[in-house]
Amino acid sequence: QGQDRHMIRMRQLIDIVDQLKNYVNDLVPEFLPAPEDVETNCEWSAFSCFQKAQLKSANTGNNERIINVSIKKLKRKPPSTNAGRRQKHRLTCPSCDSYEKKPPKEFLERFKSLLDKMDHQHLSSRTHGSEDS
């Protein structure tokens, strides 16, 4: 059941990113570190970089509430066992600052791409009977 809940949470994050993509014009047009083509076993490290990024509502009024709620939900921390498991074999993942900085639209697209990749990895690890999650 924990595995299922974990997968639901990851897919929920994908939906949150999708919702935020509707509001890119209401986000502060700041350039943010946006990992891309993340190396195997560095997915959780890159995920953490996305979560740490200062994505912000431009406070332009109408959609401010849903944007702020969504951003806060994107920062929900997964249990450290999940975050640590895939990285146990690799100690040297790139620092957040080393990733190319992108505006909110591309930042969200890259975040979604990483979440999709992690979702597929999780599915395949379950199919092959691995305990990784």
């Epitope: 639901i8 929900r76 999940n82």
Partner: antibody, heavy 126, light 106 residues
Framework: QVQLVESGGGVVQPGRSLRLSCAAS????????MHWVRQAPGKGLEWVAF????????YYADSVKGRFTISRDNSKNTLYLQMNSLRAEDTAVYYC???????????????????WGQGTTVTVSS | EIVLTQSPGTLSLSPGERATLSCRAS???????LAWYQQKPGQAPRLLIY???SRATGIPDRFSGSGSGTDFTLTISRLEPEDFAVYYC???????FGQGTKVEIK
């Protein structure tokens, strides 16, 4: 069982204040965001306010902003709504509702209000 | 802010018939963010559907939700006497409700 019980409603004059309470039981209150929703007589549902599970963020409908304050005491499993400068248009049944998206990664994940109280009636009249 | 428009305002049907309720959003809504509630007279609302199509705990399978983007639908496949009530859609996050659709006995 999971339960929310509102109290504190009553008849109050315009411009006066009232504090509503919502007692939660049967679940880990401190891991859920909470809402107040109201319903004027014969009307639809109107969301009023939301507070994050740990009280770190609060959101309000424009119609109550600056007049109403949502708060919570996790040690008492209780949600509050302080209503100041009450107006006739605040007359309604006030419901507290649990946000279905738990802060726990492995907890409930519903994007909706999954548990509701029975409501308490507030009448603002001179 | 997003506006949710429900139609029809009232639906007059007989028990056993199929009910189709519509909820249209003024801007695109991620399906995870769309919920449906049922409210009977003198009672609190009850969560029926979350994530546009997932039934909440204890909700019978005659209730189903569908849709994406700006158009969402709640379908009751065969109306039971206890289904006659008011139904509301809601966007999560802004927590805006639609104005409601009343399903009444014909």
């Amino acid at each position: 069982q999971v339960q929310l019980v509102e109290s504190g409603g009553g008849v109050v004059q315009p411009g006066r204040s009232l504090r509503l309470s919502c007692a939660a039981s049967g679940f880990t209150f401190s891991t859920y965001g909470m809402h107040w929703v109201r319903q004027a007589p014969g009307k639809g549902l109107e969301w009023v306010a939301f507070i994050w599970y740990d009280g770190s963020d609060k959101y309000y409908a424009d119609s109550v902003k600056g007049r109403f304050t949502i708060s919570r005491d996790n040690s008492k499993n209780t949600l509050y709504l302080q209503m100041n400068s009450l107006r006739a248009e605040d007359t309604a049944v006030y419901y507290c509702a649990r946000d279905g998206d738990s802060s726990d990664w492995y907890g409930d994940y519903y994007f909706g209000m999954d548990v509701w109280g029975q409501g308490t009636t507030v009448t603002v009249s001179s | 802010e997003i506006v949710l428009t429900q139609s029809p305002g009232t639906l007059s049907l007989s028990p056993g018939e199929r009910a189709t309720l519509s909820c249209r959003a003024s801007q695109s809504v991620s399906s995870s963010y769309l919920a449906w509630y049922q409210q009977k007279p003198g009672q609190a609302p009850r969560l029926l559907i979350y994530g546009a199509s997932s039934r909440a705990t204890g909700i019978p399978d005659r209730f189903s939700g569908s849709g994406s983007g700006t158009d969402f639908t709640l379908t009751i496949s065969r109306l039971e006497p206890e289904d006659f009530a008011v139904y509301y859609c809601q966007q999560y996050g802004s927590w805006t409700f639609g104005q409601g659709t009343k399903v009444e006995i014909k």
